[in-house]
């Protein structure tokens, strides 16, 4: 979603979105200086009026959080940045059309890996987003993407892996050797929009089998 650079004052105006947190970012060009200031405006696709983003007027940092302003994941949005440097004319650049549903990337899930003697349990915790339901609840990724599922891998050694996947939040890899270290990885996928998170990785050791020690 990057605009073409035609000025030395401002370039690469784009949205960077992760788990529906939508941050507008940009770079200062070679002509920008430490006194260059930036102002941000945004609008919903189809509307004429640009709205100034409070807190992102005449700022020196090169980012602006537009999560709340672009919260409706079913809508498209534009944002634009105006750069002003001492004595020079303002330069404005606009983003491409932005849809958080299409463009957001998915962060690794939050997972608890629980070792047992002959198994490892993995509990996936639902990921909250800033997107709100009509009654004001924060939505989880699972409530936004019908096709969201989890892919779990357990690396037993360099040559052998065990796999599980599904829409459940609780999984258990069974039939493992006691007192052995395993590497688990859990990824979120949404097939229709071709999204895939980086994996959450946990290194866990099954518990020692103490039953024989007391016989």
């Amino acid at each position: 979603h990057t605009t073409v650079d035609t000025s030395g004052l401002l370039q690469h105006v784009k949205f960077q979105s992760s788990n529906f947190e939508n941050i507008l970012t940009w770079d200062g060009g070679p002509a920008s200086t430490s006194d260059t200031v930036y102002s941000v405006e945004y609008k919903k696709y189809g509307e004429r009026k640009w709205l100034a983003k409070a807190g992102c007027q005449r700022i020196t940092q090169k980012f602006c959080n537009l999560t709340m302003e672009t919260r409706n994941h079913t809508e498209f949005y534009y944002a634009k940045v105006t750069a002003v440097s001492a004595g020079g004319p303002p330069v404005t650049k606009m983003t491409d059309r932005f849809s958080s549903l299409q463009h957001t990337t998915i962060k690794p899930p939050d997972v608890t890996c629980i070792p047992k003697v002959r198994s490892i349990q993995m509990l996936v915790h639902p990921t909250l987003t800033p997107v709100l339901s009509e009654d004001g609840h924060q939505l989880t990724l699972e409530e936004i993407f019908h096709d969201l599922f989890y892919r779990l891998e357990l690396h037993v050694n360099h040559t052998y892996q065990m796999h599980l996947e599904g829409k459940q939040r609780e999984y258990e890899f069974l039939g493992l050797t006691p007192d052995t270290e395993f590497l688990g990885s859990i990824t979120i996928l949404t097939p229709i929009l071709s999204k895939e998170s980086a994996p959450y990785v946990c290194r866990v050791k099954t518990l020692p089998d103490r039953t024989w020690a007391y016989s």
Epitope: E143, K167, Q168
Partner: antibody, heavy 117, light 107 residues
């Protein structure tokens, strides 16, 4: 105990409308994926529509898009399917179902919809 | 849409026989597959999820296998209560789609 009870089926003429209801209990209705699935006489099963009761996100099978509308009343734990411009090929038993802990494991007993002149 | 092709469409079995039903997906669905049993006039009952995991309360004579595009449901030792229609369902992407069903009857 999870319970889903459909109602609202009946005989309707082609081009007519019906509104199906599904009363739900025994689980957290206000944060679930709810489905309408149909089965034509002597035929297989077909998913018609789905809604997330919290986000309001909906999906439809292509054959009913623009004619059917899925909705909920979370205060009353009820799922609806508004069916307009009905065709003879919509004749079926309509089931509501829900996904709990990742699995589509709970179904109602179904309500019969017959579209005929 | 993902097409699910189930075979055979019907089969006859004697009590105690082993029965195998196949399901083919038109694209890779990993292990996102359910198997259901349906008796006449009743809603479907979940038997297998994740292609091979047995749902709680389902007898161990039912088993599922496969991944990617090819899946199998096996009933090891058919009992009277198993005479029904069986459906596979892909849970990978919307619209969720069923196979055409396999009716298991008594020989």
């Amino acid at each position: 105990e999870v319970q889903l009870v459909e109602s609202g089926g009946g005989l309707v003429q082609p081009g007519g409308s019906l509104r199906l209801s599904c009363a739900a209990s025994g689980f957290t209705f206000s944060s679930s994926w709810m489905y309408w699935v149909r089965q034509a006489p002597g035929k297989g099963l077909e998913f018609v529509s789905v809604i997330n009761t919290r986000s309001g996100i909906t999906h439809y099978v292509e054959s009913v898009k623009g004619r059917f509308t899925i909705s909920t009343d979370n205060a009353k734990n009820t799922l609806f399917l508004q069916m307009n411009s009905l065709k003879s090929e919509d004749t079926a038993v309509y089931y509501c179902a829900t996904r709990i802990q990742g699995l589509i494991d709970y179904w109602g007993q179904g309500t019969q919809v017959t579209v005929s002149s | 849409d993902i097409q699910m092709t189930q075979s055979p469409s019907s089969m006859s079995a004697s009590l105690g026989d082993s029965v195998t039903i196949s399901c083919q997906a038109s694209e890779n669905i990993g292990t996102q597959l359910f198997w259901y049993q349906q008796n006449a006039g009743q809603p479907p009952k979940l038997l297998i999820y994740g292609a091979s995991r047995l749902q709680t309360g389902v007898p161990s004579r039912f088993s599922g296998s496969g991944s990617g595009t090819t899946f199998t449901l096996t009933i090891s030792g058919v009992e009277t209560g198993d005479l029904a229609t069986y459906y596979c369902l892909q849970d990978y992407s919307w619209p969720l789609t069923f196979g055409q069903g396999t009716k298991v009857e008594l020989k």
